[in-house]
């Protein structure tokens, strides 16, 4: 990679991309924007899907963490020939569908949607798009919108989670590259470390969860620290403090030496979880330590 910023968060990332007739001469810029962004999400637990919409929504690459499949998906994306209407709701339908399938598997991974469009949505199409984006939210997704050229920012603020979840690109498609850093920073929710990473068996502790994006939740009161103990039981704890780069959480009491708790974070009261490779382990502590 080029040494630029990267995201280590483990979640499901959906790109919903406008391929209507109006982007015909700008598809390369859209492709390079997605390609640059895709390469910066580097967690092995991150899965990605490419969805395109015009008069119909199509899942170009179904959800996968396989980097070879993602490479092939990007190749398919580059070959897309834009044309048709801007049925953005069709793109959201295809994302919601996949989130629903993943949720029905039992384990609920957090979902982040980045939807890109140009142009204003006609009233009925805006209604459908907002409705489908709401359905994605109901299923636990965080929704960001990228608006290029003649977009309506008020519309996109209602399709996205909030005005702060909209990335306006007013200078046309060539300016898409300029927002990669900020979209990565805003859409990335990652767990980087836990302090302490080793705790005393049988004792109560507080853990500082280091990372990024913890205040990207629609409601910070719904942020939870989650501990998956020995790959079986999951315990959710309400943090004492939520800051963008850290959480202060009560750690569960792990009774035995050698127990492991994998750290996860939920941004929506346990509806879905961001996974990580961060593990807290227990050790024997003598009375004087």
């Amino acid at each position: 990679e080029d040494g630029g910023p990267a995201c280590y968060g483990g979640f499901d990332l959906y790109f919903i991309l406008d391929k209507s007739g109006s982007v015909l001469h700008h598809w390369n810029e859209i492709y390079y924007f997605v390609e640059q962004l895709a390469h910066r999400f580097i967690s092995p637990q991150l899965r990605m899907s490419f969805i395109v919409f015009s008069t119909r929504g199509t899942t170009l690459m179904k959800l996968t963490e396989d980097r070879e499949q993602i490479r092939q998906g990007l190749e398919e994306l580059q070959k897309v020939l834009p044309g048709g209407d801007t049925y953005m709701h069709e793109g959201f339908e295809r994302a919601s569908e996949q989130i629903y399938y993943e949720n029905s598997q039992g384990y609920r991974t957090a979902s982040v949607i980045i939807a890109l469009t140009d142009g204003e949505l006609h009233e009925d199409l805006f209604f459908y798009s907002e409705r489908e984006a709401n359905r994605s939210r109901d299923l636990g997704a965080i929704v960001y919108c990228v608006g290029v050229k003649d977009f309506n920012e008020t519309q996109l603020a209602r399709i996205a989670d909030s005005k702060d979840h909209v990335f306006p690109v007013n200078d046309g498609f060539q300016a898409l590259q300029g927002i990669i850093h900020s979209i990565l920073k805003k859409s990335c929710i990652e767990i980087l470390a836990a302090e302490p990473s080793t705790i005393c068996a049988g004792e109560s502790f507080q853990v500082v969860v280091r990372g990024n994006g913890f205040r990207h939740a629609r409601n910070v009161d719904r942020v939870l620290c989650s501990f998956k103990i020995n790959d079986s039981v999951t315990l959710n704890e309400k943090p004492f403090a939520v800051e963008d780069t850290y959480l202060l959480c009560p750690a569960p009491i792990l009774k035995e030496v050698g127990m492991k708790a994998a750290l996860q974070v939920s941004m929506n009261d346990g509806l879905s979880f961001i996974s990580s490779s961060v593990i807290i382990t227990t050790t024997h502590c003598s009375d004087g330590s």
């Epitope: 199509t58 899942t59 569908e97």
Partner: antibody, heavy 117, light 107 residues
């Protein structure tokens, strides 16, 4: 465990309105994401989807039957109701309700509705 | 809406592999689900999201989907697998079913 059961008249006259009730247990319609669909199957023919109601009360209908169908839910009673106006003999079918959003993972056993004068 | 087309019937000898197709325009870009329906019974979901198997469904049932065709494969077909099979997808807020395929297990 999840169970669904359809109830309603076995016989309706042409031009009448059919009202079917789906009573379910083992899941809640107030939970995000899912919903209940109605599907029918004329004797010896294929399945035909009719309508769906989501947990957030959004509704969707079969394009060809949209003007005749109404779906509603009573979350407290764990019931979903389908009404179909202006019944015709070609509407004779087994009517099923099923749980799901984008696919249907649990089905009722179905209720046969005959339309005849 | 998308149209899903299935062959009316497929025959297979016991122990052999049965393949039931479901075709539609660029069906690989959407998800396909499969139901089994035995006479006088309600349909049962056997495959969802192209290839995922619900709990309780035997491993001999599998699914794939690419291009313009989704396929339900039953390996080592048994007499009890004789039934009607329907593919289904989701398109523009509607659930769409294929016309159904009658699977006959010979002998």
């Amino acid at each position: 465990q999840v169970q669904l059961k359809e109830s309603g008249p076995a016989l309706v006259k042409p031009t009448q309105t059919l009202t079917l009730t789906c009573t379910f247990s083992g899941f809640s319609l107030s939970t995000s994401g899912g919903g209940v669909s109605w599907i029918r199957q004329p004797p010896g023919k294929a399945l035909e989807w009719l309508a769906h109601i989501y947990s957030n009360d959004d509704k969707s209908y079969s394009t060809s039957l949209k003007t005749r169908l109404t779906i509603s839910k009573d979350t407290s009673k764990n019931q979903v109701v389908l009404t179909m106006t202006n019944m015709d003999p070609v509407d004779t079918a087994t009517y099923y309700c099923a749980r799901g959003g984008y696919f249907l993972d649990y089905w009722g056993q179905g209720t046969l509705v005959t339309v005849s004068s | 809406d998308i149209e899903l087309t299935q062959p009316p019937s497929v025959s297979v000898a016991p122990g052999q592999t049965a393949r039931i197709s479901c075709s539609g325009d660029n069906i690989g870009g959407i998800y396909v689900h499969w139901y089994q329906q035995k006479p006088g019974q309600a349909p049962v979901l056997v495959i969802y999201a192209d290839s995922k198997r619900p709990s309780g469904i035997p491993e001999r049932f599998s699914g794939s989907n690419s291009g313009n065709t989704a396929t339900l494969t039953i390996s080592g077909t048994q007499a009890e697998d004789e039934a009607d099979y329907y593919c289904q997808s989701y398109d523009i807020t509607s659930l769409v079913f294929g016309g159904g395929t009658k699977l006959t297990v010979l002998g």
